[in-house]
């Protein structure tokens, strides 16, 4: 039975040209995280594998940085980066947990981050 829950940074906004941290946290389960995939719609951005470390998709290498932790940092944001991002936690023995973050990239300098929670 899958007992875990994923907390995310929720709906967030950022300025064009800036950077943003996408972060998820899996709680309420003792399952071992074997891999976390970060995806934008149907595109794979990055993988963090518990055994094998990070892999950044070649097309995103210039604008994506691993971390902090299992999170992902998006840099040099453009308006085209607006959209849904998913953290997909592969765990043993539970299976797969998915979290959703919506990022809005704004032209103006009035972008405000959504409410954040502390991720250990």
């Amino acid at each position: 039975m899958m007992t875990g829950t994923i907390e995310t940074t929720g709906n967030i906004s950022a300025e064009k040209g800036g950077s943003i941290i996408l972060q998820c946290h899996l709680s309420s389960t003792t399952a071992q995280v074997t891999q976390v995939n970060w995806e934008q719609q149907d595109q794979l951005l990055a993988i963090c594998n518990a055994d094998l470390g990070w892999h950044i998709s070649p097309s995103f290498k210039d604008r994506v940085a691993p971390g902090p932790g299992l999170g992902l940092t998006l840099q040099s944001l453009t308006v085209n980066d607006t959209g849904e991002y998913f953290c997909i936690y592969h765990t043993y023995p539970d299976g797969t947990y998915t979290g959703r973050i919506f990022l809005e990239v704004l032209e103006s300098s009035v972008a405000e981050h959504g409410a954040r929670f502390q991720i250990p």
Epitope: N49, G53, P66
Partner: antibody
Framework: QLQLVQSGAEVKKPGASVKVSCKAS????????MNWVRQAPGQSLEWIGV????????SYNQKFKGRVTMTRDQSTSTAYMELNSLRSEDTAVYYC???????????WGQGTLVTVSS | DIQMTQSPSSLSASVGDRVTITCRPS??????LAWYQQKPGKAPKLLIY???ALAEGVPSRFSGSGSGTDFTLTISSLQPEDFATYYC?????????FGQGTKVEIK
């Protein structure tokens, strides 16, 4: 305290196989990955592969794929690395090493010298 | 695979000297770099991880810096027990690779 103890030195002929063991103590064996790293005489270190002792996932350095087999015995907290079709260039000290945190190796076995000679 | 280039391959220094070793990966590894010390006939010992974090029990005269493709290990005041070979290793994404080593010898 936390320790990795490896099996003794081996001398093998070309074409033979060798199996090196690594017994863990002082921690929960299934909690941390076990890596194998080798060092030829006077050379640098070379990562061979990793086994996750909990669910048994194994990943090999492509250079060794097909020649190396990693296994573990949870009941004895022991990891094994078998290398077959040995050649003279496989002469090296073979180390087991934990990645206790993330992907660097902070606990090492004492090393096992494998000599391949006709 | 990521290639790790260390320099110099060897150096001679005296007790009390400040020693600097550099490591240059062939591609960006962010801060995923570790440094090890190895003495003859012994297993490597972890000194630094995440480019600058000191491993447990390692003296504060050892320090690491850098990110991306340029990293440095510094020994601020060389002690007799520091004469050894030093290796860098990236821990970004497998396969993990090591530099060719820097041997620190007594002048």
């Amino acid at each position: 305290q936390l320790q990795l103890v490896q099996s003794g030195a081996e001398v093998k002929k070309p074409g033979a196989s060798v199996k090196v063991s690594c017994k863990a103590s002082g921690y929960s064996f299934t909690d941390y990955n076990m890596n194998w790293v080798r060092q030829a005489p006077g050379q640098s270190l070379e990562w061979i592969g990793v086994i996750n002792p909990n669910h048994g996932t194994i990943s090999y350095n492509q250079k060794f794929k097909g020649r190396v087999t990693m296994t573990r015995d949870q009941s004895t907290s022991t990891a094994y690395m078998e290398l077959n079709s040995l050649r003279s260039e496989d002469t090296a000290v073979y180390y087991c090493a934990n990645n206790w945190d993330v992907w660097y190796f902070d606990v090492w076995g004492q090393g096992t010298l494998v000599t391949v000679s006709s | 695979d990521i290639q790790m280039t260390q320099s110099p391959s060897s150096l001679s220094a005296s007790v009390g000297d400040r020693v600097t070793i550099t490591c240059r990966p062939s591609e960006n590894i962010y801060s995923y770099l570790a440094w090890y010390q190895q003495k003859p006939g012994k297993a490597p010992k972890l000194l630094i991880y995440n480019a600058k974090a000191l491993a447990e029990g390692v003296p504060s005269r050892f320090s690491g810096s850098g990110s991306g493709t340029d990293f440095t290990l510094t020994i601020s005041s060389l002690q007799p027990e520091d004469f050894a070979t030093y290796y860098c290793q990236h821990h970004f994404g497998a396969p993990w690779t090591f530099g060719q080593g820097t041997k620190v010898e007594i002048k």
